[in-house]
């Protein structure tokens, strides 16, 4: 039982499923990164607190022409209850620091693993 990959199918979908998929996508990005991610584009750093998913999307959506994070952008939109457009900053309460997309993804990944560990799947 220590190596449970998936639950019996068909069966109830665990609440962890969507967060697991997002984490796996960010892991893929960090592991497959060869050249600077998104050509070294800079994005607003976010507070990893309430409203974090919308804030993350609002920050990343301003990166255009970067196919590596397009799936992440789509997945984050599933966690954010409102529509997010480029240039929108309603959830980004503090916009004082910009970091590279690669660092943003690493920070987000660490935090999402913490949420997973804590059983916070909302």
């Amino acid at each position: 039982l220590t190596c449970l990959g998936g639950f019996a199918s068909p069966g109830p979908v665990p609440p962890s499923t969507a967060l697991r998929e997002l984490i796996e996508e960010l892991v893929n990005i960090t592991q497959n990164q060869k050249a600077p991610l998104c050509n070294g584009s800079m994005v607003w750093s976010i507070n990893l607190t309430a409203g974090m998913y919308c804030a993350a999307l609002e920050s990343l959506i301003n990166v255009s022409g970067c196919s590596a994070i397009e799936k992440t952008q789509r997945m984050l939109s599933g966690f954010c209850p409102h529509k997010v457009s480029a240039g929108q900053f309603s959830s980004l309460h503090v916009r004082d620091t910009k970091i590279e997309v690669a660092q943003f993804v690493k920070d987000l990944l660490l935090h999402l693993k913490k949420l997973f560990r804590e059983g916070q799947f909302n």
Epitope: C3, G5, F116, Q120
Partner: nanobody, 119 residues
Framework: EVQLLESGGGLVQPGGSLRLSCAAS????????MAWVRQAPGKGLEWVST???????TYYADSVKGRTISRDNSKNTLYLQMNSLRAEDTAVYYC?????????????WGQGTLVTVSS
């Protein structure tokens, strides 16, 4: 050493109730989400319910509505209150500790407690 020890299972008639407990040790219980997972005879593992580290968020499989997951962080104990039990609830019930890995949602499991619903 992390240990999860389930108790409270047994033989109960249809419509009856049981409260399962899971005593945790060897880690900071209050920092981790916990879950109940069950395995019916001859079937695969089935997720039942999840509770967040602080108890604020709870999640249930549709098939087990009417159950209540709870935790007492001061006692390092996880609970599952099961009312209106049916024959389909017969299974070994495991508690599990959340930790992300590519292979699994959990890094530690208990040894399980058997619930048998029969008249």
């Amino acid at each position: 050493e992390v240990q999860l020890l389930e108790s409270g299972g047994g033989l109960v008639q249809p419509g009856g109730s049981l409260r399962l407990s899971c005593a945790a040790s060897g880690f900071t219980f209050a920092d981790y989400g916990m879950a109940w997972v069950r395995q019916a005879p001859g079937k695969g593992l089935e997720w039942v319910s999840t509770i967040s580290y602080n108890g604020l968020y709870t999640y249930y499989a549709d098939s087990v509505k009417g159950r209540t997951i709870s935790r007492d962080n001061s006692k390092n104990t996880l609970y599952l209150q099961m009312n209106s039990l049916r024959a389909e609830d017969t299974a070994v019930y495991y508690c599990a500790k959340y930790e992300y890995s590519p292979e699994s949602d959990f890094d530690y499991w208990g040894q399980g407690t058997l619930v048998t619903v029969s008249s």
